[in-house]
């Protein structure tokens, strides 16, 4: 009610002889500040004196002085809120009731606190979760209802008497609600922790043992099993007997069911701790284990690999890889179920034993066509020899072999003929599916492997064919040796190197680019007249009369070929000059007279000079000299000179006679 002082503190505090006690305490006085405080041990109220009797452990005076014998007990509070106390050291006879007598100006109060001091350090208390399961993290708690600032302690966890390695978290509480020291240890128990002793040990600051609490771990776990087999190596022969025993090394709680598994599958009607296998067959080879269940779940033993030994079964051959390419490597593997594994093998190729081949694998580093065929093997172990299986077929693939190009025509082949060629080969695997020809042309292939060349050209020198399956094999080129008339016949001047001047020595060559056959004859012709039968036509001293159109012919057994006409040009100085007169060499004065300088020259005359009877050159340089009107004085002998790049020529004198006209005669 409102007439009470309000106090907060732990109801009971625990300690032991020689330790200390720290009493956290708060209060609220009814009025004003605290004026007097007395700490009683086991106070008793005396009705006669209306005061409390008992041992006074602490007494505060108005002046705040404390007698020296009270140093063991300390009031750590104040005048209005804090009433914390410390007793250090605490003794066994301090057990009982502590009475806090508080007085203010007008009010008084007695607050009682229980103190429990034991002769020896009391043990902490281990708290476990209600259930511990293997591999599930748990927290172990060690609680001690003691904490005091003046007396440091530690809690240590032990497993089977030795310190636990896991990290523990220690906490202390010194509050008005509770006083304790607590250590919490988190760990993940395994089934093997079951039944083990865990200790929480209370130690002083120096690690000296004070007290402890122990618990036995009850770790729930699936059954832990051991499997034993007779014979111990679990290797038997067909017809033998085998016994397997399942032993439970640990189960918590107790196991409920037992079963056996082979290769992970449950064996029916096998629900005892012993598995008896009588007259075993090879099919009973495999991995066996026992499974025992409890409320936590099933536990399995390690697997026992039972090997039932038997002679090799009929073998099969595996080829890596078929079809094989010639030149590649191939591996043959002899596969035969046997226990123990075969130790020896016999290999057969097309039914014939392969000498020196006794391994499970046969390796051929470089396959050849003759390696093709059927491969079989026989496996052998300590129990016997197996049967030869059906074998496997090795297909060796290779490009077409010995490819040749064959000319079907009668020889020789002439230009323009139709030529037929065939592509032949010796063997091929896989079969030839196509052919290729070189060089490529617009030729027809009337059937597979046959080439027809219509109107064969003179220059179709060689042809090669390829027969192709997955690969192409080329034949050596075959020469068609096409025969043809001489080609590209032409006339070539050998000398002189420059233009031909009259009197030069001249040689003409009849050239051709090719001829097959090579043996040829030559013919030279000018204006349809045969000049010679040599490859060269020679002129010791050429004359203008030799100029003209020349042709040469070259012929062989196939035919003859003519060159284009070649013009022979001879350069010479003007010659055969003469002066012609028009209308004649006798002209009447007053008329017109034309003198023409005629010549034969190559190149033509480029420059003319006229002379009179006095050899005086006249101021005229054209081919014609026109006199108009002509005078009697013009009468006389005239000559002309012609010039070209080669030289000069002069004409003989030609006389012009100018006679008087009738008029002139009439005047005279």
């Amino acid at each position: 009610d409102s007439s009470k002082w309000v106090f907060e503190h732990p109801e009971t505090l625990y300690a032991w002889e020689g330790a200390c006690v720290w009493i956290p305490c708060t209060y609220r006085a009814l009025d004003g500040d605290l004026e007097s405080f007395i700490l009683f041990h086991n106070p008793e109220y005396n009705k006669n004196t209306s005061k409390f009797d008992g041992t006074r452990l602490y007494e505060s005076t108005k002046d705040g002085k404390v007698p020296s014998e009270q140093k063991r007990v300390q009031f750590l509070g104040d005048k209005n809120k804090n009433c914390t106390l410390s007793i250090h050291p605490v003794h066994l006879n301090d057990s009982g009731q502590l009475g806090l007598r508080m007085e203010s100006k007008t009010e008084k109060w007695m607050e009682r606190i229980h103190l429990n001091v034991s002769e020896r350090p009391f043990p902490p208390h281990i708290q476990l979760p209600p259930e511990i399961q293997e591999s599930q993290e748990v927290t172990l708690t060690c609680l001690l209802n003691f904490s005091c600032y003046g007396y440091p302690i530690q809690l240590q966890w032990l497993l089977e008497g030795v310190p636990m390695r896991q990290a523990a978290v220690t906490s202390t509480s010194l509050t008005i609600k509770s006083v304790f020291t607590r250590s919490e240890l988190k760990f993940s128990p395994q089934w093997s922790h079951h039944g083990k002793i865990v200790t929480c040990q209370l130690q002083d600051a120096d690690g000296k043992f004070l007290s402890n609490d122990t618990v036995q771990l009850n770790v729930k776990h699936t059954p832990k099993l051991e499997i034993k087999v007779t014979p111990s190596d679990a290797i038997v022969r067909e017809g033998d007997s085998v016994t397997m025993t399942c032993e439970v090394s640990s189960s918590n709680p107790e196991y409920t069911t037992v079963s056996w598994l082979k290769d992970g599958t449950s064996l029916k009607k096998q629900n005892t701790f012993t598995l008896n296998l009588r007259e075993v067959t090879k099919d009973q080879s495999g991995k066996y284990c026992c499974q025992v269940s409890n409320d936590v779940g099933p536990g399995r033993s390690e697997e026992v690999f039972l090997q039932v030994q038997y002679a090799p079964e009929p073998s099969t051959v595996q080829i890596l890889h078929s079809p094989a390419v010639e030149g590649s490597q191939v591996e043959f593997l002899c596969m035969s179920l046997a226990n123990p594994l075969p130790t020896n093998y016999t290999w057969y190729h097309n039914g014939k034993e392969m000498q020196g081949r006794t391994e499970e694998k046969v390796h051929i580093p470089k396959i050849l066509p003759w390696h093709a065929g059927t491969y079989s093997c026989v496996a052998e172990n300590i129990l016997g020899t197996g049967q030869r299986g059906p074998g496997a077929e090795l297909d060796v693939q290779y490009p077409p072999k010995k490819v040749t190009t064959v000319i079907q025509n009668p020889m020789p082949i002439r230009e323009g003929d139709t030529v037929t060629l065939s592509c032949n080969y010796n063997s091929s695997n896989p079969s030839v599916t196509r052919y290729e020809w070189k060089p490529h042309g617009a030729w027809e292939e009337p059937s597979l492997g046959v080439l027809k060349i219509q109107n064969v050209g003179w220059d179709n020198t060689t042809i090669a064919c390829a027969a192709c399956n997955s690969w192409c094999s080329w034949a050596s080129p075959v020469a068609l040796n096409v025969q043809y008339a001489p080609r590209d016949v032409r006339v070539r001047k050998i000398k002189p190197l420059s233009e031909i001047h009259s009197g030069n020595s001249v040689s003409l060559q009849c050239d051709f680019s090719s001829s097959h056959p090579k043996e040829v004859q030559f013919f030279w012709e000018k204006n349809g007249r045969l000049l010679g039968k040599e490859s060269q036509l020679n002129f010791d001293s050429i004359s203008p009369e030799d100029a003209g159109s020349y042709s040469c012919w070259v012929n062989n057994s196939i035919g003859q070929t003519a060159s284009k006409a070649w013009t022979l040009e001879v350069l010479y100085a003007p010659r055969r000059l003469r002066v012609s007169m028009s209308p004649g060499d006798q002209v009447m004065e007053g008329k017109s007279a034309t003198l023409t300088c005629e010549s034969d020259a190559n190149p033509p005359v480029s420059h003319y000079t006229w002379f009179d009877w006095n050899n005086q050159s006249l101021p005229y340089h054209s081919q014609k000299l026109r006199l108009e009107p002509v005078k009697v004085q013009h009468s006389g002998a005239y000559w002309c000179q012609g010039t070209n790049s080669v030289g000069k020529g002069r004409s003989p004198l030609s006389t012009l006679t100018v006679y008087y006209s009738p008029e002139t005669i009439g005047r005279r």
Epitope: S135, E137, Q156, L158, L159, E160, G161, V162, P163, M164, R165, Q166, A167, K186, F187, S188, P189, Q190, S192, H193, K196, I197
Partner: antibody, heavy 118, light 108 residues
């Protein structure tokens, strides 16, 4: 200083038994546990089991249960590990290691090479 | 049992560089994880325990971090003597221990 000294290398045949010793010195032998760990060539470390030198109680790895026995002789501060029915896959280096306790530091033996071969 | 997975299997680092090694637990192991160094022909040597506390005599360049299921060992500046195999070990189920298969730290 703390030291763990193991017995020397062994060569065994399949089916035989093996017993390795581990002598502790430089500390209070009974205040700690001893773990046994093995390492097969090129493999991970594998914990085999533990014994409390305080009272001789043991915890074994399940896969070795029934084949392994760990003991101590407190008078000579020596721990022993016996492995029976040896197999070729028991070839390994076997180590003993002292528990770290509250200090955090652990100590290992130098290792014993065991070869199991027929 | 608690399975520890270490990554990477091999770590190629140049001397002076930083190396970060990872260890993952299949179940929480709180901070009950240790790191070991092993050199050829030698026993493992404790580096870190309690996930982050350096063992006696271990240089400050080695540091550990993490809790629960994810843990990291960091070597801040690799020295020539640090090239070795590093294992993590959980002791949450002590005395039953499990180890990671290791990370090999090799010279780049």
């Amino acid at each position: 200083q703390v030291q763990l000294v193991q017995s020397g290398a062994e060569v065994k045949k399949p089916g035989e038994s093996l017993k390795i010793s581990c002598k502790g010195s430089g500390y209070s032998f009974t205040s700690y546990g001893i773990s046994w760990v093995r390492q097969a060539p090129g493999q991970c470390l594998e914990w085999m089991g533990w014994i409390s030198a305080y009272n001789g109680n043991t915890i074994y790895a399940q896969k070795l249960q029934g084949r392994v026995t760990m003991t101590t002789d407190t008078s000579t501060s020596t721990a022993y590990m016996e492995l029976r029915r040896l197999r070729s896959d028991d070839t390994a280096v076997y180590y003993c290691a002292r528990d770290p306790g509250v200090t955090g530091d652990d100590y290992w033996g130098q290792g014993t090479l065991v070869t199991v071969s027929s | 049992e608690i399975v520890l997975t270490q990554s990477p299997a091999t770590l190629s680092v140049s001397p002076g560089e930083r190396a970060t090694l990872s260890c993952r637990a299949s179940l929480s192991v709180s901070s009950n994880l240790a790191w070991y160094q092993q050199k050829p022909g030698q026993a493992p040597r404790l580096l870190i325990y309690g996930a982050s506390t350096r063992a006696t005599g271990i240089p400050a360049r080695f540091s550990g971090s993490g809790s629960g299921t994810e843990f990291t060992l960091t070597i801040s500046s690799l020295q020539s003597e640090d090239f070795a195999v590093y294992f993590c070990q959980q002791y949450h189920s002590w005395p039953a221990l499990t180890f990671g298969c290791g990370t090999k730290v090799e010279i780049k």
